[in-house]
């Protein structure tokens, strides 16, 4: 029986979440990131879609840019030039990947508030960006870097050899883009513009993947992309350095791989640039437990890059990969060579350790059984950071200052008793010096955006609190939310359970486990959402649990490594058990648990259907991953290694989908993938559809022609609602 | 007022070992990354070690790793160099120092005690 | 990292200018600091970072340099200013010491 919701007059004038609420995105709230022009001014995309400067310290604030301006080229962004003459307009935005886009680029003059006439830019535009200093323009088009001193100037073509789907320079191809850089782009400015970074990918001899999209002509288009899945040829990368003052001069300069990288296949895995004649850049092995930051020194005389032996610095694991998700970036110190980076300390934690001569002697700055999460700035007398050490609650997130221009430094909780019970997990933004930041505050109360001075930590204003959120939300039984821990087998086991609005620990509901689980994730977060799952417990008296197992991340490497050549075990052993410890609390009604998850929870969620524990009646994979010989190298052989016999076939052959095709006979299986899926191919679920046919197993599929691996437009509609009419049949809930 | 004042020095045989002492007053000793220098008769300076405040990090200079052993104590405000199987070349005056944290993480030498002599000789 | 230290002594007269230079066998990024030793005292901290004085440290006295090569300036010399002269640097540990420099009155 369906608990009943209604329990008094007053809860009788609220209403329960629709599913209507949630494809509207009724419920959806605002953040606000400054986008900071100096030390105390910023920029901001007002109501009415003007561009208007503020200035902290004036309190006053001016349009640069009308709305009319922005409507005249139709642009849906913008971006000042450092010497604040010119704006680029970008209009016609047209997607591509995860974070690459095409546009057209229109430039316009704030001197005599006209667009720039003559030598314009080309269409469509891969990427575009101002250099740090001045108006330089550096953009890629066609595959090609160009180069413009001023944007009415003629371009300078600095590569020539760019082809589609073969070289890419200064963006990257698709899986640097999506497993390395996350990044639509592959080019650095040096911090006074002096110099341009910018990487070569060739994937000349990577395999294609071939999809068709269907469109509206008589025949499909096949979509070609050169995506090296685990174990097949990878891209090779080169890094160039050119001198944007006088390009035509030595051209661009190749910097050296260190010799302990180049010794096998590699990966380059980011550039930071330290002043303009200092650069460094990190390296990766194939096998990807071994880092290799190298400083790179500019040598007047011989005007190429020098890349000393004694500034190169090995980051190794030896208990799993190398990094988190990414391998951390360093933050430089204002002495121009020692540097703040995040990475395991003995105990098997991430902190922050201040680097100068060798890793071996590196300050530890921070520590504990919590891990530092990213470094926002530093300088002369701050170090900021954000962490989850308050409270000990991985799923939380609080912002920190260290004096580090004193001893010992002492250190500050910045954000730990602003708003305790609303805000618990904060990024921040910075403004040049850390004069003045950003909170940005995003649960698990409603979210909410604040402007701080960098020396006192005062607050000045509120950015954004989200009002008319909060005011919508006054009629709505909400569900409840409740963030805990089970202790198995020592290992913590956090989870977010979502429970109806007026639950009664004496009844029975039925259960939706929601997974992810994939390699250094976290699902179990203090954030506000109003959304699917939300619904799913608010309308029909469902209860949602998230469960953080093996395998995820910011609880130490114990929990992130275990899975390390092993994906598809403990990750579906530990949703599995939580299950259990579900059940035995009382309220779980037994028959009635469902298990659904999206990508890497796709996977989760398919191995735990066909686990034969019999816990699970249903269960939906969305664009699920079924053997991880069909994923991409960068991101698969991160945790699995190679797809050889001397290496980790065994387990790649192993931990299929399709090797279980027998045990989804006693569950209820619902299988979803976009036909156009770049990521995820639509290849992973034909497979185990084919399987469970050849097994004779029956099961329920959607495909979403032409769509990628979001589901995104009407799709979204479509795929909740059918999703949300597969779990209410499963537990017998009436439409 | 700052002052470092080194004692414990003087005549020991070939193979034997000493105890220096550094007593500290006039500034915050336990914050203060501290160090031994010493000067042969009619030579230059030469490193021998550093200790940073709370004794989790010594570090020395390579050829004198096994002999000597530095160590602090907070509460009595007292640094300590141990020396051990010393021979004729460790005939020197024994400087203790400390000084001022440097941002980003090191520190200069800028007070110096007068020094103590250490003469080896059978 | 060896610290070689140029000249090991000269002879100047009050009111001269003089220059010591010091080597690093590898870059030392600045990590450099100063030092004077007057006969029979302790020595004192003049410069750190490379070029930034100490406390007290009259503007007379001025350090530069980059990578390897350090140099320690004193303009218009002071008769106080004759005694023994030390470059160490503070990259990685041993934090060694260059041979010296003896100034002496002529």
């Known amino acids: 029986l369906r608990p009943s919701r209604v329990h008094n007059s007053e809860e009788n004038t609220m209403r329960a979440l629709t599913l209507k609420d949630i494809l509207n995105g009724t419920f959806s709230y605002k953040t606000f990131f400054p986008n900071w022009i100096s030390g105390q001014e910023y920029l901001h995309q007002s109501a009415d879609n003007n561009i208007v400067l503020y200035n902290i310290e004036t309190g006053q604030s001016y349009t640069i840019l009308s709305n009319r301006t922005m409507k005249s080229v139709n642009a849906s962004n913008y971006g000042l030039s450092p010497d604040r003459q010119f704006v680029y307009l970008e209009s016609d935005y047209s997607k591509l990947w995860r974070y690459s886009y095409t546009a057209t680029y229109y430039i316009y003059d704030l001197s005599n508030g006209e667009f720039v006439r003559g030598n314009e830019l080309p269409r469509p535009i891969q990427y575009l960006c101002w250099s740090p200093v001045g108006s330089k323009l550096a953009y890629v088009y066609q595959n090609n870097i160009y180069l413009k001193q001023r944007p009415g100037d003629p371009p300078f073509q600095i590569t020539f050899n760019g082809r589609e789907n073969k070289i890419f320079n200064g963006i990257p191809d698709w899986v640097y883009e999506e497993e390395m850089l996350a990044t639509k782009y592959a080019l650095w400015w040096s911090p006074n513009g002096k110099f341009l970074a910018y990487a070569e990918f060739n994937d000349t001899d990577i395999p294609v993947i071939a999809y068709s999209y269907y469109g509206d002509e008589q025949y499909p288009r096949t979509i070609n992309i050169p995506y090296p899945k685990a174990g097949a040829k990878n891209p090779v990368v080169r890094i160039f350095i050119i001198d944007t003052t006088y390009p035509a001069y030595v051209g661009p300069q190749e910097v050296p791989v260190p010799a302990m990288i180049a010794s096998s296949d590699y990966y380059f895995s980011w550039l930071t640039w330290v002043t303009d004649e200092r650069v460094c850049l990190q390296w990766l092995k194939r096998v990807q437990n071994v880092s290799v930051l190298s400083i790179c020194d500019f040598r007047e005389d011989w005007q190429t890059w020098d890349c000393p032996k004694t500034q190169e610095h090995i980051e190794e694991s030896r208990t799993g990969w190398a990094g988190g998700f990414f391998v951390s970036t360093p933050v430089f110190s204002y002495d121009a060579i020692s540097y703040y980076k995040i990475f395991s300390d003995k105990d098997g934690y991430k902190h922050i350790h201040y680097i100068k001569d060798t890793v071996e002697n590196a300050i530890q700055i921070t520590s504990g059984k919590w891990e530092a999460i990213n470094i926002f700035r530093v300088t002369q007398d701050s170090l900021f950071y954000s962490s989850n050490e308050f409270e000990e609650y991985p799923g939380r997130r609080n912002i920190y200052r260290i004096s580090i221009g004193s001893y010992p430094p002492s250190k500050k909780c910045v954000t730990c008793h602003l708003r305790k019970e609303r805000c618990q997990y904060y990024t921040a933004s910075f403004s040049d010096y850390a004069k003045y930041y950003a909170l940005v505050c995003y649960g698990p109360g409603i979210p909410i955006s604040t402007l701080h001075d960098g020396r006192t930590d005062q607050e000045i204003k509120i950015l954004e609190e989200n009002k008319e959120l909060e005011n919508a939300l006054k009629n709505i039984q909400l569900p409840k939310e409740e963030i805990k821990k089970l202790e198995v087998d020592e290992i913590t086991l956090w989870y977010k359970m979502i429970l109806p609005p007026q639950f009664d620990r004496s009844k029975k509901y039925p259960l939706l486990i929601q997974v992810y689980g994939g390699p250094c994730s976290q699902s179990v977060r203090s954030v506000f959402a109003v959304n699917w799952i939300s619904y799913l417990a608010s309308k029909e008296g469902m209860v949602i649990a998230l469960v953080d197992g093996r395998g995820t991340a910011f609880q130490g490497d114990k929990l992130l490594y275990a899975v390390y050549r092993k994906l598809g075990v403990y990750e579906v052993e530990d949703q599995i058990t939580a299950v259990r410890k579900f059940i035995e609390m009382g309220f779980i009604d037994e028959k009635r648990i469902a298990i659904w998850g999206w990508s890497y929870g796709g996977y989760v969620s398919s191995l735990a259907l066909a686990s034969g524990t019999g816990l699970f009646k249903c269960g939906i994979a969305v664009a699920p991953v079924s053997s991880w010989e069909y994923y991409a190298s960068v991101y698969t052989e991160r945790f699995m290694g190679l797809p050889t016999k001397d290496d980790n076939l065994e387990h790649y052959k192993n931990s299929t989908v399709m090797a279980r095709a027998e045990y989804f006979r006693n569950v209820d299986y619902l299988l979803i993938h976009g036909t156009a899926d770049d990521n995820v191919h639509f290849q992973n679920s034909a497979q185990i559809a084919k399987a469970l046919v050849n097994a004779q197993v029956d099961f329920q599929a959607m495909w979403y022609s032409d769509q990628n691996h979001g589901l995104s437009g009407l799709s979204t509609n479509h795929l909740y609602t059918h999703m949300t009419h597969f779990l209410k049949q499963c537990f017998s809930l009436s439409d | 007022e700052v002052q470092l004042l080194e004692s414990g020095g003087g005549l020991v045989q070939p193979g034997g070992s000493l105890k220096l002492s550094c007593a500290a007053s006039?500034?915050?000793?336990?914050?203060?990354?501290m160090s031994w220098v010493r000067q042969a008769p009619g030579k230059g300076l030469e490193w021998i070690g550093e200790?940073?405040?709370?004794?989790?990090?010594?570090n020395y200079t390579p050829s004198l790793k096994d002999k000597f052993i530095i160590s602090r104590d907070n509460a009595k405000n007292t640094l300590y160099l141990q020396m051990t199987k010393v021979r004729s070349e460790d005939t020197a005056l024994y400087y203790c120092?400390?000084?001022?944290?440097?941002?980003?993480?090191?520190?200069?030498?800028?007070?110096w005690g007068q020094g103590t002599t250490v003469t080896v000789s059978s | 990292l060896q610290m070689t230290q140029s000249p090991a002594s000269l002879s100047a007269s009050v009111g001269e200018t003089v220059t010591i230079t010091c080597r690093a066998s590898g870059n030392i990024h600045n990590y450099l600091a100063w030092y004077q030793q007057k006969q029979g005292k302790s020595p004192q901290l003049l410069v750190y970072n490379a070029k930034t004085l100490a406390d007290g440290v009259p503007s007379r006295f001025s350090g530069s340099g980059s990578g390897t090569q350090y140099s320690l300036k004193i303009n218009s010399l002071q008769p106080e200013d004759f005694g023994s002269y030390y470059c160490q640097h503070f990259w990685s540990t041993p934090y060694t010491f260059g041979g010296g420099t003896k100034l002496e009155i002529k």
């Open positions: 120092a400390g000084g001022y944290y440097r941002y980003p993480y090191y520190y200069t030498m800028d007070y």
């Open positions: 006039g500034f915050d000793f336990s914050t203060y990354w």
């Open positions: 200790i940073n405040p709370d004794s989790s990090t010594v």
